[in-house]
């Protein structure tokens, strides 16, 4: 047999469905099994209650990605193996990684007092996450447009040059990735 469609790396959120593709050709038609980190993967063919289904095509379908604080049964490196009595073919490795976004910010912004006309800098480090979270800022619950020439956002820093009285307010840093969004504690610019 030979593998004609190899599985691809995937990053997926906990609780979401996903599929690792695999297609094989051969005569006689090969059977397909999946292995994760070297251990055979149980599917609905072994246990009807399984959250993993072996599709007729040979792909592995996850009804929902299961991922706990400690047990992470779906995360790992997968291969599909196609077999018939003439031999076997092994696919390329595909990693299944579970997206993550923690709640706690590595650095919350702190209150800043600045004189009008002076620059102001607010700093933030988003929560740990996978993929690595990006950030944006809100002022008084409204997203800040960083296209305004006085405002620049680089890394975790919000820099306002030549501050005005109208810049005063409550600033919140928002960390975001495919899992969702997390709001920092607000910081007051006075």
């Amino acid at each position: 047999p030979r593998i004609v469609e190899h599985p691809s790396d995937v990053i997926v959120s906990k609780g979401e469905p996903t599929t690792l593709n695999c297609k094989a050709e051969g005569r006689p038609t090969p059977t397909i099994e999946w292995y994760k980190d070297g251990e055979r993967v149980e599917t609905d063919k072994d246990d009807p209650r399984s959250h993993r289904m072996l599709l007729p095509s040979g792909s592995l379908f996850f009804l929902r990605i299961v991922h706990g604080r400690r047990s992470k049964p779906d995360e790992g490196s997968y291969v599909c193996v196609a077999r018939n009595y003439l031999g076997e073919a092994v696919s390329r490795n595909a990693s299944l990684e579970v997206a993550l976004l923690r709640d706690d910010f590595r650095q919350n912004p702190t209150d800043v007092v600045v004189a009008a006309g002076e620059p102001a800098i607010l700093e933030c480090q988003p929560p740990r996450g996978h993929p690595e979270p990006t950030i944006y800022w809100k002022k008084d619950k409204v997203r800040i447009d960083d296209k305004e020439e006085r405002i620049s956002i680089r890394g975790g820093k919000l820099m306002i040059s030549n501050t005005r009285k109208s810049d005063a307010g409550m600033y919140t840093c928002v960390g975001t990735n495919m899992v969702g969004e997390r709001d920092s504690d607000p910081a007051e610019l006075t």
């Epitope: 149980e42 246990d47 299961v66 991922h67 706990g68 604080r69 400690r70 047990s71 992470k72």
Partner: antibody, heavy 118, light 105 residues
Framework: EVQLVQSGAEVKKPGASVKVSCKAS????????MHWVRQAPGQGLEWMGW????????NFPQKFQGRVTMTRDTSITTAYMDLSRLRSDDTAVYYC???????????WGQGTMVTVSS | DIVMTQSPSSLSASVGDRVTITCRAS??????LNWYQQKPGKAPKLLIY???SLQSGVPSRFSGSGSGTDFTLTISSLQPEDFATYYC???????FGGGTKVEIK
């Protein structure tokens, strides 16, 4: 069928050690943490620690540190719990339990009675 | 360590009664709380995980609620097979509550 099957009852003298086994079947052994929980006669459930079958890493509450050892053999999908320097108050039913991806003990062994008596 | 306090330690009830068991954590555990049922001579059985999610195969008369430090297990209409001991467990540090024995009145 997903199940955990434990070794049989043991009778031990004070100061001895006991090793209880837990054979897992019907699921990917290395994907789920294995825990040990004990229950003295007429008492509640007491968590003893966990082993990550993938890495072999372990964690125990302070009460059991230095006296309990948890190991696994992935080739036969079996976890082991070794308790040393046994005392009479270690008399209990010892359970292994699988921790699901929902952070709960969804599959339990049938229990192993360990009696410590002189 | 986070200490889990269950109350009451025992209660008497009749078939058809609504039964409520509470569990209090010594500090916030968000929704990391599970409930188990144990019958004499048997291993515990998972009923509720993540404070309010019903484990597959468990009758819908069992429900869980709460978050933070205060949690409740409710049996809406007690059945003869529900007479057992119930344990809460926090899944951060994994310790169990002391148990609640539900007996026939």
């Amino acid at each position: 069928e997903v199940q955990l099957v434990q070794s049989g009852a043991e009778v031990k003298k004070p100061g001895a050690s006991v090793k209880v086994s837990c054979k897992a079947s019907g699921y990917t052994f290395t994907g789920y943490y294995m825990h040990w929980v004990r229950q003295a006669p007429g008492q509640g459930l007491e968590w003893m620690g966990w082993i990550n079958p993938n890495s072999g890493a372990t964690n125990f509450p302070q009460k059991f540190q230095g006296r309990v050892t948890m190991t696994r053999d992935t080739s036969i999908t079996t976890a082991y719990m070794d308790l040393s320097r046994l005392r009479s108050d270690d008399t209990a039913v010892y359970y292994c339990a699988r921790e699901s991806g929902d952070d709960a003990f969804d599959i339990w062994g049938q229990g192993t009675m360990v009696t410590v008596s002189s | 360590d986070i200490v889990m306090t269950q109350s009451p330690s025992s209660l008497s009830a009749s078939v058809g009664d609504r039964v409520t068991i509470t569990c209090r954590a010594s500090q916030s555990i968000s929704s990391y709380l599970n409930w188990y049922q144990q019958k004499p001579g048997k291993a515990p059985k998972l009923l509720i995980y993540a404070a309010s999610s019903l484990q597959s195969g468990v009758p819908s008369r069992f429900s869980g609620s709460g978050s933070g430090t205060d949690f409740t297990l409710t049996i809406s209409s007690l059945q003869p097979e529900d007479f057992a001991t119930y344990y809460c467990q926090q899944s951060v540090g994994l310790f169990f509550g002391g148990g609640t024995k539900v007996e026939i009145k």
